[in-house]
Amino acid sequence: IWELKKDVYVVELDWYPDAPGEMVVLTCDTPEEDGITWTLDQSSEVLGSGKTLTIQVKEFGDAGQYTCHKGGEVLSHSLLLLHKKEDGIWSTDILKDQKEPKNKTFLRCEAKNYSGRFTCWWLTTISTDLTFSVKSSRGSSDPQGVTCGAATLSAERVRGDNKEYEYSVECQEDSACPAAEESLPIEVMVDAVHKLKYENYTSSFFIRDIIKPDPPKNLQLKPLKNSRQVEVSWEYPDTWSTPHSYFSLTFCVQVQGKSKREKKDRVFTDKTSATVICRKNASISVRAQDRYYSSSWSEWASVPCS
Amino acid sequence: RAVPGGSSPAWTQCQQLSQKLCTLAWSAHPLVGHMDLREEGDEETTNDVPHIQCGDGCDPQGLRDNSQFCLQRIHQGLIFYEKLLGSDIFTGEPSLLPDSPVGQLHASLLGLSQLLQPEGHHWETQQIPSLSPSQPWQRLLLRFKILRSLQAFVAVAARVFAHGAATLSP
């Protein structure tokens, strides 16, 4: 058993049929010694008396808010949550496996630049009685500070018969050094509580591996005289790190016909313009990627040819 | 060339070669986090590689003030990786074909380090840890770790030379 926060405790249980469970001793936070009784949740049934209460925690029915009273007055509370371990593996019932980039990916994180700011998100099908708490650091043995906000519900989607909820959190490294080569990864830890179930999820990454620039901005076409060619131009996204002579991007320009089956013409360039042939009913799209490190491409910025 | 006394390197040549190094490093190990081996082996194996850290003056302001600190750090790293890529870690099994990007990477690391340091002048170089894994799986794990680390190192070096070519070239 360990303390998650004041008056909230997590009991770690090996979860299998007829498991013996864990013996837990609760102590009432009071100077009083006599006349103390204990109850669980809203029940008025007295579970025991005395300053301490010893219970055998085996299942969710044994978890909940234990309260000690004296003469009708509440003295203190202890909320017990359960953390299940099945076949040596901690349960992951609350969050959905996003399976990208690999199986058992529950947390996904992205950064728009090298400033040390990043966003993480996760998915669940649970709609109520759900709380999240997020902590982060750079490195684990001698951790350096990363400050995370509160996790918020950022999107709701219908997937078949189920509703899916996306939560996200923004974090910022306290003393970021955008130009340095990271040697210690960022660690992100999410505590999830659904009713009386506790689970924790972690992710470890370098900012450079989660970089995904915003799409290029101000995408424009300029027809070239007496030609089917056009000059496409664009600018670095506002959110990208500066100076651009140091934090450079590379770009992919694509000409795509109306039909998905039509052949795509692609050009790669380090410049912020390119000359392409604009076919009727086609569209021109441009996306960006860090020039020197192959992290994710941005989403496409697009304009129609006509 | 970054000769002693603080004269400038051939920024544009360094820029071109460092960008080529980035491409080669990603050709040699294009995939991220796909290894079944990643949980195995000793984490200490690549902890000794030289990193370009915050105080090394490789940020735009540091380069403007005095690029020598940063160039020396980059040179140290290039020599370190060049030695690793020429070692048994990369020559033993699993076999690399003669068209492997590792061979070109090795040559380009040497080429860039020579651009930064002419004959007759020696910056201090970091000691290479004596890593001599006997098993193919240990060797492969080390290769992947070294190449991932090299990708990060050459990305910073390429940014330095791109910025230098754009803002510090005579």
């Epitope: - | 050709s27 040699a28 190990h29 294009p30 995939l31 796909h34 290894m35 079944d36 081996l37 099994e93 699993p94 076999s95 690399l96 074909l97 003669p98 068209d99 492997s100 990007p101 590792v102 061979g103 098993q135 193919p136 799986w137 060797r139 492969l140 794990l141």
Partner: antibody
Framework: QVQLVQSGAEVKKPGSSVKVSCKAS????????MHWMRQAPGQGLEWIGY????????KYNENFKGKVTITADKSTSTAYMELSSLRSEDTAVYYC?????????????WGQGTLVTVSS | EIVMTQSPATLSVSPGERATLSCKAS??????VAWYQQKPGQAPRLLLF???TRHTGIPARFSGSGSRTEFTLTISSLQSEDFAVYYC?????????FGGGTKVEIK
């Protein structure tokens, strides 16, 4: 796209030689090693060897040394595999293939195969 | 040379079922193993490399695992087009070698 097109089927007498060609397109021929495999009827695959067209260097499976010669013509982006002193056991489908560009020998593109039949 | 031993030689499976193919190397090959699919009259087609990484365009029902000497190819739910011969291949040591193949046939 990358393609490897092999020469047609051959029927040869024991003791003679045969030269199978593999024409490459869609990539820089000199930049990658070209490998040869064989598959006897109803059997598994055997790696014969490779040539690196950039410098002409070759490496052979010991089991095929003296039996096989691999060459390449840079001007036509074509690799050749010559089998000498043919015996009935050399009856097989011969494949050319190129590996991934990371420098390890998993084979991403294969020729369609050339059946060589050795029969008197 | 490294001997790659595949088992079983033939696997009879119903469409929609799971198929598990085994490959054992006579010595440590790290994860330098590829898997190929071959249909009659066709050249082999690459499925996986580094023991578990799917080649471009290969469906997610194909997965691989293992390291050093023991490797597995799993086809989670067999489709009609998956009935073929499967070969494992080590590219750790010269001469590169292939397993004898496992024929996956319709039950």
């Amino acid at each position: 796209q990358v393609q490897l097109v092999q020469s047609g089927a051959e029927v040869k007498k024991p003791g003679s030689s045969v030269k199978v060609s593999c024409k490459a397109s869609g990539y820089t021929f000199t930049a990658q090693t070209m490998h040869w495999m064989r598959q006897a009827p109803g059997q598994g695959l055997e790696w014969i060897g490779y040539i690196y067209p950039r410098d002409g260097s070759t490496k052979y499976n010991e089991n095929f040394k003296g039996k096989v010669t691999i060459t390449a013509d840079k001007s036509t982006s074509t690799a050749y595999m010559e089998l000498s002193s043919l015996r009935s056991e050399d009856t097989a489908v011969y494949y050319c293939a190129i590996p991934d560009r990371s420098g390890y020998a998993w084979f991403i593109v294969w020729g369609q195969g050339t059946l060589v039949t050795v029969s008197s | 040379e490294i001997v790659m031993t595949q088992s079983p030689a033939t696997l009879s499976v119903s469409p929609g079922e799971r198929a598990t193919l085994s490959c054992k190397a006579s010595r440590d090959v790290a994860i330098a193993v590829a898997w190929y699919q071959q249909k009659p009259g066709q050249a082999p087609r690459l499925l996986l490399f580094w023991a578990s990484t799917r080649h471009t365009g290969i469906p997610a029902r194909f997965s691989g695992s293992g390291s050093r000497t023991e490797f597995t190819l799993t086809i989670s739910s067999l489709q009609s087009e998956d009935f073929a011969v499967y070969y494992c291949h080590q590219y750790s040591s010269y001469p590169f070698t292939f397993g004898g193949g496992t024929k996956v046939e319709i039950k």
